[in-house]
Interface confidence: medium
């Protein structure tokens, strides 16, 4: 018997009341993979949730958020604000970045401008709240007489840190 | 669904302090943002605090700070809200709201509590 | 604080009107504006959130548009049960504020 419901392909289930025959989802339920017994509820995409995509009989429904929100947690399980470029979202709203910090997206938090000494190289071009710092060759590739054969050093792509 | 029932009215004098509370079904209260807002007679909704479940930090409006104070019973699903040292110009009626399943300081508030009616008179 | 200023605080209209109430803010808040409806004896309950997201059971001739500083709820045909009193409320910083509130009364 074991064998006839491993028959049932994706987007149905085996109806035990009908003899282990494989039949479709019902509307609004899906089946991932062979072999179900039953079939999930689609995740409905309401409130703050926006669909992304339909549900199918093979596949769950897939949410977004809505305009000025962004997902957060495995699947879009939550919908946190935006904030603008330069900025972080606190417990009291959006708040621009601190000097010497940045933010080049709408969520996530301010980071510290890299610090081109530490790889000894100087500032080619200040950060601000939105955009870090560009690194450039070293003070003393700068220097009269210094070698310009070697090409800048491309700017560091900043870490991103886990959203 | 999220459903919120709050505490019976309460007669209470100056100075004195009052325990709003507001009990959570449908969902846990560790789901869920709690908010505080009340509406003086005849007036409009003042926003009181609320209450973050993802770091348990709590946040007062200036009005409030140092009277008010925002507890939570996980095991019982109920939070309450403490006034203090209370003035006739508290009368009012007492709301508890969240925000809605799935929304990070989204601050809009959804459901409500029926009210808790609070009457401060000597 | 944000402040938040409705216009008109009271109007009159008959069942079927179509019904305007703005809402400006002192500041802007993108789009982190909802609007509420009350009842004599009730709790607030949101019709709109984000400045134009319908909240689920709110029926279809509610509508929220407007960003920035200036936004709007209409009622395309006012029905019996919408004559209440609406509030704003902006959720774009802390403290939330909310409008003075809109008293929708029978012509």
């Known amino acids: 018997l074991q064998d006839l419901c491993s028959n049932c392909p994706a987007g149905t289930f085996c109806d035990n009341n009908r003899s282990q025959i494989c039949s479709p989802c019902p509307p609004n339920s899906f089946s991932s993979a062979g072999g179900q017994r039953t079939c999930d509820i689609c995740r409905q995409c309401k409130g703050v949730f926006k669909t992304r995509k339909e549900c199918s009989s093979t596949s769950n429904a897939e949410c977004d958020c809505i305009s000025g929100y962004h997902c957060l947690g495995a699947e879009c399980s939550m919908c946190e604000q935006d904030c603008k470029q330069g900025q972080e979202l606190t417990k009291k709203g959006c708040k621009d970045c601190c000097f010497g910090t940045f933010n080049d997206q709408k969520r996530g938090i301010c980071r510290p401008w890299t610090n081109c000494s530490l790889d000894g190289k100087s500032v080619l071009v200040n950060g601000t709240k939105e955009r870090d710092v560009v690194c450039g060759p070293s003070p003393a590739d700068l220097s009269p007489g210094a070698s310009s054969a070697t090409p800048p050093a491309p700017a560091r792509e900043p870490g991103h840190s886990p959203q | 669904e999220v459903q919120l029932v709050q505490s019976g009215a309460e007669v209470k004098k100056p100075g004195a302090s009052v325990k709003v509370s507001c009990k959570v079904s449908g969902y846990t209260l560790t789901e869920l943002s709690m908010h505080w807002v009340r509406q003086s007679p005849g007036k409009g909704l003042e926003w009181m605090g609320s209450?973050?479940?993802?770091?348990?930090?709590?946040i007062y409006a200036q009005k409030f700070q140092g009277r008010i104070t925002m507890t939570e019973d996980t095991s019982a699903d109920t939070a309450y809200m403490e006034l203090s040292s209370l003035r006739s110009e508290d009368t009012a009626v007492y709301y508890c709201a969240t925000e809605g399943v799935g929304v990070i300081r989204g601050n809009w508030f959804d459901p409500w509590g029926q009210g808790t009616l609070v009457t401060v008179s000597s | 604080d944000i402040q938040m200023t409705q216009s008109p605080s009271s109007l009159s209209a008959s069942v079927g009107d179509r019904v305007t109430i703005t809402c400006r803010a002192s500041?802007?808040?993108?789009?982190?504006l909802n609007w509420y409806q009350q009842k004599p004896g009730k709790a607030p309950k949101l019709l709109i959130y984000?400045?134009?997201s319908l909240q689920s059971g709110v029926p279809s001739r509610f509508s929220g548009s407007g960003s920035g500083t200036d936004f709007t709820l209409t009622i395309s045909s006012l029905q019996p049960e919408d004559f209440a009193t609406y509030y704003c409320q902006q959720s774009y910083s802390t403290p939330p504020t909310f409008g003075q509130g809109t008293k929708v009364e029978i012509k």
């Open positions: 984000a400045a134009s």
């Open positions: 500041q802007s808040i993108s789009s982190y």
């Open positions: 209450f973050y479940p993802e770091d348990g930090e709590t």
